[in-house]
């Protein structure tokens, strides 16, 4: 039994790290393999993860970690019974993939402005709580080419956009993801999307002027 692609891990920097690897051939990951991990510290428990299959030869393991600090380092040992297949280490702070933002809501009743809000997925005592910035993806449900990304480079989990920038009488969807620049993280997964109907109508004067102008051509 051989490891074809060594484990690579990412951490949400609160409680969960996910490691993935590929074996040399079809493997029943949960029956044949164990990933043992331990924090390099004075008082730390040895933990064991039972991997799941990710395709015929791929394995994935969810490592539970608690109270992470920036300097944390874990030893990782991949076992097949009594045989040590691979030995490595993992520093969560250097491989951060934030949790996805939660509770994305779109408010359409704020005059001619769309207000999108979501919640930071971290509690206030976590380092990432004050470090996340966001990207919001808005797209037209009926036209895949009508899609845009808004970079939210401030920390407030809100975005205001003019309803007039979107097509009137169309259903739109939005989703949001996060990253932590200071920890050189990857982007989080996208949040679940939320849907709304853009009922914005152009003001009469503008509409009338537009129509008149058109008539002369």
């Amino acid at each position: 039994m051989k490891v074809l692609q060594e484990p690579t891990c990412v951490s949400d920097y609160i409680s969960l790290s996910t490691c993935e690897w590929k074996m040399g051939g079809p493997t029943n990951c949960s029956a044949e393999l164990r990933l043992v991990y331990q924090l390099v510290f004075l008082i730390s428990e040895t933990n064991m993860c039972v991997p799941e299959n990710n395709g015929a030869a791929g394995c994935v393991c969810h490592l539970f970690m608690e109270d992470m600090v920036g300097a944390d380092n874990y030893t990782l040992d991949l076992w097949a019974g009594q045989q040590l297949l691979w030995k490595g280490s993992f520093k969560p702070s250097e491989h951060v993939k934030p949790k996805a933002p939660e509770n994305l809501t779109v408010y359409t009743n704020v005059s001619e402005t769309l207000l999108l809000t979501w919640s930071n997925p971290y509690p206030p005592d976590n380092y990432l709580y004050e470090k996340l910035t966001y990207a919001v993806n808005i797209w037209n449900e009926n036209d895949p080419t009508d899609s845009r990304i808004y970079d939210v480079t401030y920390q407030e989990p809100t975005l205001r956009i003019a309803a007039s920038t979107l097509k009137s009488g169309v259903s739109y969807r939005a989703r949001v993801r996060a990253w932590a620049q200071s920890y050189n993280s990857t982007w989080s997964e996208w949040s679940p999307s939320t849907k709304w109907y853009n009922a914005y109508k152009e003001p009469f004067e503008k509409h009338h002027h537009h129509h008149h102008h058109h008539h002369h051509h």
């Epitope: 609160i14 008082i43 600090v69 920036g70 702070s93 005592d125 380092y127």
Partner: antibody, heavy 116, light 112 residues
Framework: EVQLVQSGAEVKKPGATVKISCKVS????????MHWVKQAPGKGLEWVGR????????IYASKFQGKATITADTSSNTAYMELSSLRSEDTAVYHC?????????WGQGTLVTVSS | DIVMTQTPLSLSVTPGQPASISCRSS???????????LEWYLQKPGQSPQLLIY???NRFSGVPDRFSGSGSGTDFTLKISRVEAEDVGVYYC?????????FGQGTKLEIK
């Protein structure tokens, strides 16, 4: 052997500032959160705040926001707490404690007395 | 803030007899990672506190097995199966799940 050795007792006048230290041996402070806990004379324990020495990220109990400032020097493996605008109610023993992820190691405490 | 309420506030026990201290939190102390960071500390006279129990039920290394922790949700209990003279001091429960972290007001254990 793990030791958290705190600086000696301090007597300060109201309005003054005091900075107390907690020198750690036996482990690297970057590997834990360093917390401070207050114990007023004859009273119970009160959590003040904590620091992640790796990145300097601090968090405080709201009543100590603006009162306490926690810092850490990883090169000397020492945590500090500064208390400003001292008043008589700040008179207490202050303990430094490492938490990973529970309070396993405590300093011996530093008595700060505020008296005119 | 989460308030941790201990009962009783004082306890006088004959050596060899059991003792029980209750700790109630004003709201759930389950952390977002699923753990319950409920701990028990003993502060012996003239000493710094020492850890007895972590995560509700786990005895810290070197703690005698006469100490046990139990509970869930908002109600937690520390039991000493047979009190010994060295157990005197003030016992504190503590929640480390939600900032600001909070201690109970303490329970003083004396020997009869």
């Amino acid at each position: 052997e793990v030791q958290l050795v705190q600086s000696g007792a301090e007597v300060k006048k109201p309005g003054a500032t005091v900075k107390i230290s907690c020198k750690v041996s036996g482990f690297n402070i970057k590997d834990t959160y360093m917390h401070w806990v207050k114990q007023a004379p004859g009273k119970g324990l009160e959590w003040v705040g904590r620091i992640d020495p790796t990145n300097g990220y601090t968090i405080y109990a709201s009543k100590f926001q603006g009162k306490a400032t926690i810092t850490a020097d990883t090169s000397s493996n020492t945590a500090y707490m500064e208390l400003s605008s001292l008043r008589s109610e700040d008179t207490a023993v202050y303990h430094c404690v490492s938490r990973r992820p529970w309070f396993a190691y405590w300093g011996q405490g530093t008595l700060v007395t505020v008296s005119s | 803030d989460i308030v941790m309420t201990q009962t009783p506030l004082s306890l006088s026990v004959t050596p060899g007899q059991p003792a029980s201290i209750s700790c109630r939190s004003s709201q759930s102390i389950v952390h977002s990672n699923g753990n319950t960071y409920l701990e028990w500390y003993l502060q012996k006279p003239g000493q710094s506190p020492q850890l007895l129990i972590y995560k509700v039920t786990n005895r810290f290394s070197g703690v005698p097995d006469r100490f046990s922790g139990s509970g869930s949700g908002t109600d937690f209990t520390l039991k000493i199966s047979r009190v010994e003279a060295e157990d005197v001091g003030v016992y504190y429960c503590f929640q480390g799940s939600h900032v600001p972290y909070t201690f109970g007001q303490g329970t003083k254990l004396e020997i009869k």
